[in-house]
Interface confidence: low
């Protein structure tokens, strides 16, 4: 009976010892898993930070690039606007100048039939000088303007003067 | 002696059982720690993805905005370039027109001293008509141009013709 009891107790001890060793192993596995998981978490955090930093840098680069391109375009636009203003002023001055010349030419052509400075009339008959008769005035006007036509093929804006 | 052995064995069993229960608790703690760590890792991943997506969206929005602003600037620049081209052509045409008028005016003034169309000379003496003498030509020229001066205060570009 005593031996039986001893055997039974020894079996209990062996069983509990086995459980003990199983638990020891399981505990170790769980601890290793925990450590691996924590390392993986740290790795994920690190990688995420790296990706975010890269994204941020790429975005900043794109933004910077866009800003520079915008600055170039803005400069080009402003220079063109300035140049256009100058050209507008130049065209305006040319139009005024043209109006003056047109008016002067008109005055000159009309003056053919009535010279501005009359010559004193002599008392008696004199030899006949070269004279201008009104009938030939239109012909004269046409010939002057014809002689000034630009070469064919160059379009000329109609005079605004 | 048997009782002593039994007592010793029982103490062993209790000790191992205590160890067992300790190990059980430690294993459970490690497993819970592992689960918590894995959940924390997933949370970190999810949050990182969210931040990345947000960064990406914000970057896309900025890029889109910059693209639109660039498109506006490019359009403005191109329109100004087009307008400038037109103004350059207009100024060129005005310059040509002015050159033509200047030449015509010169021809007209010169013609004062030598009419283009000669009038047949009569055989005998006739009453003296209005004549043009070369002496008065310069005075005539001066008066035409003076009469065409623009009002004060309007700047006029020097003629390029």
């Amino acid at each position: 009976k005593v031996e039986e009891l001893a055997r039974s107790l020894r079996m209990d001890i062996e069983r509990v010892a086995r459980e003990n060793s199983d638990l020891q192993r399981q505990k170790l596995e769980a601890q290793q898993g925990l450590q691996a998981s924590q390392e993986a978490k740290q790795k994920v955090e690190k990688e995420a930070q790296a990706r975010e930093a890269k994204l941020q840098a790429e975005c900043s680069r794109q933004t910077q690039l866009a800003l520079e391109e915008k600055a170039v375009l803005r400069k080009e636009r402003d220079n063109l606007a300035k140049e256009l203003e100058e050209k507008k002023r130049e065209a305006e001055q040319l139009r005024m100048e043209l109006a003056i010349r047109n008016s002067a030419l008109d005055t000159c052509i009309k003056a053919k039939s009535q010279p501005i400075i009359p010559v004193p009339r002599p008392m008696g008959p004199v030899p006949n000088p070269q004279t201008i008769d009104p009938a030939s005035l239109e012909e004269f006007k046409r010939k002057i303007l014809e002689s000034q036509r630009p070469p064919a093929g160059i379009p000329v804006a109609p005079s605004s003067g | 002696k048997v009782e002593e052995l039994a007592r010793s064995l029982r103490m062993d069993i209790e000790r191992v059982a205590r160890e067992n229960s300790d190990l059980q608790r430690q294993k459970l703690e490690a497993q819970q720690g592992l689960q918590a760590s894995q959940e924390a890792k997933q949370k970190v991943e999810k949050e990182a993805q969210a931040r990345e997506a947000k960064l990406q969206a914000e970057c896309s929005r900025q890029t889109q905005l910059a693209l639109e602003e660039k498109a506006v600037l490019r359009k403005e620049r191109d329109n100004l370039a087009k307008e400038l081209e037109e103004k350059k052509r207009e100024a060129e045409q005005l310059r040509m027109e002015l050159a033509i008028r200047n030449s015509a005016l010169d021809t007209c003034i010169k013609a004062k001293s030598q009419p283009i169309i000669p009038v047949p000379r009569p055989m005998g003496p006739v009453p003296n008509p209005q004549t043009i003498d070369p002496a008065s030509l310069e005075e005539f020229k001066r008066k035409i141009l003076e009469s065409q001066r623009p009002p004060a205060g309007i700047p006029v570009a020097p003629s390029s013709g």
């Epitope: - | 969210a50 931040r51 947000k54 914000e58 970057c59 896309s60 890029t63 889109q64």
Partner: antibody, heavy 113, light 112 residues
């Protein structure tokens, strides 16, 4: 689990104002853009705009500029959509959603004259 | 605004048969970051919309792989390889590339 819980149905008179709410659970609204969408009876969907609760950045569709006001309270994890001078045209179901794709169940707004 | 045109307006399909919905945009939806922000949604009767697909072809989690999205630029398609009873409802495409974001008019899928 990610959820967007919207406030209950509203019945209001023409000319009045109303404020709809959208409370998030399972995520932090400051980490995402929150969008609002309008759906009129038997009609399609119209995007109202988005808000970034983290910094208050807002983008409205031109049609809703001046009509709708989006706000957010990060402490209660809630986004809001407010309307003023309501008309019958504003009668619709309003949905909130976050950029990852989940939609709220919608709030029915009825404006009576 | 970018106009999203969906065809057909209504689609009557027998269970087990395939279905296809087209969505065309008035401007290219390719964003400067190289991504195309085109989503597909399904609104089942009496429910709020649910996103099925984002970035043209990426399936949302929990969406069966009988759904596929394709296309680029201005032309996009949603295909269902074998229609099931739970697929009935209104399908919408919507773009998130250009402000303001816009939706298609919807395609109603009916079961024959």
């Amino acid at each position: 689990e990610v959820q967007l819980q919207q406030s209950g149905a509203e019945f209001v008179r023409s000319g009045a104002s109303v404020k709809l709410s959208c409370t998030a659970s399972g995520f932090n609204i400051k980490d995402y853009y929150i969008h609002w969408v309008k759906q009129r009876p038997e009609q399609g969907l119209e995007w109202i705009g988005w808000i970034d609760p983290e910094n208050g950045d807002i983008e409205y569709a031109p049609k809703f500029q001046g009509k709708a006001t989006m706000t957010a309270d990060t402490s209660s994890n809630t986004a809001y959509l407010q309307f003023s001078s309501l008309t019958s045209e504003d009668t619709a179901v309003y949905y909130c959603l976050y950029q990852e794709g989940s939609w709220g169940q919608g709030t029915t707004l009825t404006v009576s004259s | 605004d970018v106009v999203m045109t969906q065809t057909p307006l209504t689609l009557s399909v027998t269970i087990g048969q395939p279905a296809s919905i087209s969505c065309k945009s008035s401007q290219s939806l390719l964003n400067s970051d190289g991504k195309t922000y085109l989503n597909w949604l399904l609104q089942r009767p009496g429910q709020s919309p649910k996103r099925l697909i984002y970035l043209v072809s990426k399936l949302d989690s929990g969406v069966p792989d009988r759904f596929t999205g394709s296309g680029s630029g201005t032309d996009f398609t949603l295909k269902i390889s074998r229609v099931e009873a739970e697929d009935l409802g209104v399908y919408y495409c919507w773009q998130g590339t250009h402000f303001p974001f816009t939706f298609g008019g919807g395609t109603k899928l009916e079961i024959k």
